[in-house]
Amino acid sequence: LIQERRSHQNNPAAHLTGANSSLTGSGGPLLWETQLGLAFLRGLDYHDGALVANKAGYYYIYSKVQLGGVGCPLGLASTITHGLYKRTPRYPEELELLVSQQSPCGRATSNSRVWWDSSFLGGVVHLEVGEEVVVRVLDERLVRLRDGTRSYFGAFMV
Amino acid sequence: LIQERRSHQNNPAAHLTGANSSLTGSGGPLLWETQLGLAFLRGLDYHDGALVANKAGYYYIYSKVQLGGVGCPLGLASTITHGLYKRTPRYPEELELLVSQQSPCGRATSNSRVWWDSSFLGGVVHLEVGEEVVVRVLDERLVRLRDGTRSYFGAFMV
Amino acid sequence: LIQERRSHQNNPAAHLTGANSSLTGSGGPLLWETQLGLAFLRGLDYHDGALVANKAGYYYIYSKVQLGGVGCPLGLASTITHGLYKRTPRYPEELELLVSQQSPCGRATSNSRVWWDSSFLGGVVHLEVGEEVVVRVLDERLVRLRDGTRSYFGAFMV
């Protein structure tokens, strides 16, 4: 059988997982584990929270974040924004790709009640060589990390 | 045109749908319809709730469950966990792959209020031949089945 | 190297984005932007809100809608249904493919509280040539559009 351009072995794909170091508190994007456990990179690169395309094309990109808290403490936004953003050589600013807004705190009927919520994003976007995709969560203090299964970030070429 | 390794026809894929028999109450994983309606298996096998890989590679696996209830009756967990888990010959225990925790009952402002919520999980994982993936929901009594469109489980090789 | 059937260049894929014209209030499906910004069609057609297959096969179809409101005004359903539906020459009615029900208003603890929620659907379905997939939201008045990143609809062949 003839070797074709898109075998399972070389189709770009990645799945990055949440880790203790994911939340920097610096206003930057979330950081991710790239090798341990369930995490891997195949035909995509990683740098400071970003998946970097090294082959142009359409990619299904996705991210899930696990949110949680106790009531809604003052100083925490009642709206949480979870988004995937693109960095490109063409523009200096990040471009919004896929974004969700949620108000999970409202689920707690008292200030002492524990609540959990999850936000999933996924969609097909075009990436050129060198373009980067990052995940941001505002307010990231509500992201709950554990073992890489609850918050993650990935992509594959379609 | 030469037949290549990854034509649309032979790329492993599956979509399994919720059915009346999905919820066993036995503490086991959810069970799924594999043939009727929207359900199908192509290059993957099924056994007792599990999708079974018969080709090694990276798969995008996904599941959605429809949750619902009336208020939050005592005895039901205020946190619902929905997860995809791997069974492998390498380890005796199931391995968590993708997990979400939600507190949907808190949406109901009174004990008599009907509430609905949905949990979606999806991500790329590596499966070896013979490895199995199952869906679990705790507490599964809050899963609302109807016609296979609201709760489902699927995968395809990327 | 021989040109194969599924190169990255010709694998059907699409991502359509929400626009001011998406919500018609006519009881029909949501309408979408197909060309501007992040939106594109590759090997799929579009007609009046529908993605139309011009190649038979299994497709991962997905949609996200951004929901939001202030309290839960009377006349708005407390349950929101977000679904993907198929139109086929074989049957006169639309067929439910993937559906979610949510009760996001319950998150607001008072009638004046702003709330946000997001609904994501994705799964693999079989489409014949000429079959169409549309997105419906009931009550669509709670869909919040902005710039195409918060509500969208897409597909790709697997």
């Epitope: 740098h47 090294n54 142009a56 960095r87 060198g130 | - | 190169s7 260049q9």
Partner: antibody, heavy 116, light 107 residues
């Protein structure tokens, strides 16, 4: 207008090191990805390395592990540290700005000669 | 790596001639192709990006076309300042690779 000026080239023995600089002006340097390209005497062009705004770096296989690209946005400067130089590294080295395509604007080049 | 080939490797033409240079990629690169002009002792100058888009300031006598694996650069009416070497370059996939060049000289 956009200007890129390379410097630091010269004669070096095999195994030696050299540091090239590229001074940028006429645009907001920190907003752009930057690249190095080289051209051996009488030969074609070869891409060497690039650095993104966020300082993600990519190298061609021929220089990986020996060359290091870096940038100093405060000084509007791009650098290429070249170690373990070989005869086949002899070339004119160009820096280029990446906007609509990877090599939209080029400097005039600086010659590196590796010879004993 | 993606290999880029150009033909012809050299050509002789007269002022006013219409000149076409072809570039072929070893695999599909969509429209991620750029063309450069280089004169002796000078740095390359970008002419075309995205296979057919003209760089700012480049005269419209230059045009590019093609997609996938086969591309062409056309100079509609050759002028004395156009005698140079022309390179194509793909940026669909790392590493970026250049064609070997086509030298256009005076007949």
């Amino acid at each position: 207008q956009v200007q890129l000026v390379e410097s630091g080239g010269g004669l070096v023995k095999p195994g030696g090191s050299l540091r090239l600089s590229c001074a940028a002006s006429g645009f907001t340097f920190s907003d752009y990805y930057m690249s190095w390209i080289r051209q051996a005497p009488g030969k074609g062009l070869e891409w060497v390395s690039y650095i993104s705004r966020s300082s993600f770096i990519y190298y061609s296989e021929s220089v990986k592990g020996r060359f290091t690209i870096s940038r100093d946005n405060a000084k509007n400067s791009l650098y290429l540290q070249m170690n373990s130089l070989r005869a086949e590294d002899t070339a004119v080295y160009y820096c280029a700005r990446w906007e609509l395509s990877p090599f939209d604007y080029w400097g005039q080049g600086t010659l590196v000669t590796v010879s004993s | 790596d993606i290999q880029m080939t150009q033909s012809p490797s050299s050509l002789s033409a007269s002022v006013g001639d219409r000149v076409t240079i072809t570039c072929r990629a070893s695999q599909g690169i969509s429209n991620y192709l750029a063309w450069f002009q280089q004169k002796p002792g000078k740095a390359p100058k970008s002419l075309i990006y995205a296979a057919s888009s003209l760089q700012s300031g480049v005269p419209s006598k230059f045009s590019g076309s093609g997609s996938g694996t086969d591309f062409t650069l056309t100079i509609s009416s050759l002028q004395p300042e156009d005698f140079a070497t022309y390179f194509c370059q793909q940026y669909n996939t790392y590493p970026f690779t250049f064609g070997p060049g086509t030298k256009v000289d005076i007949k």
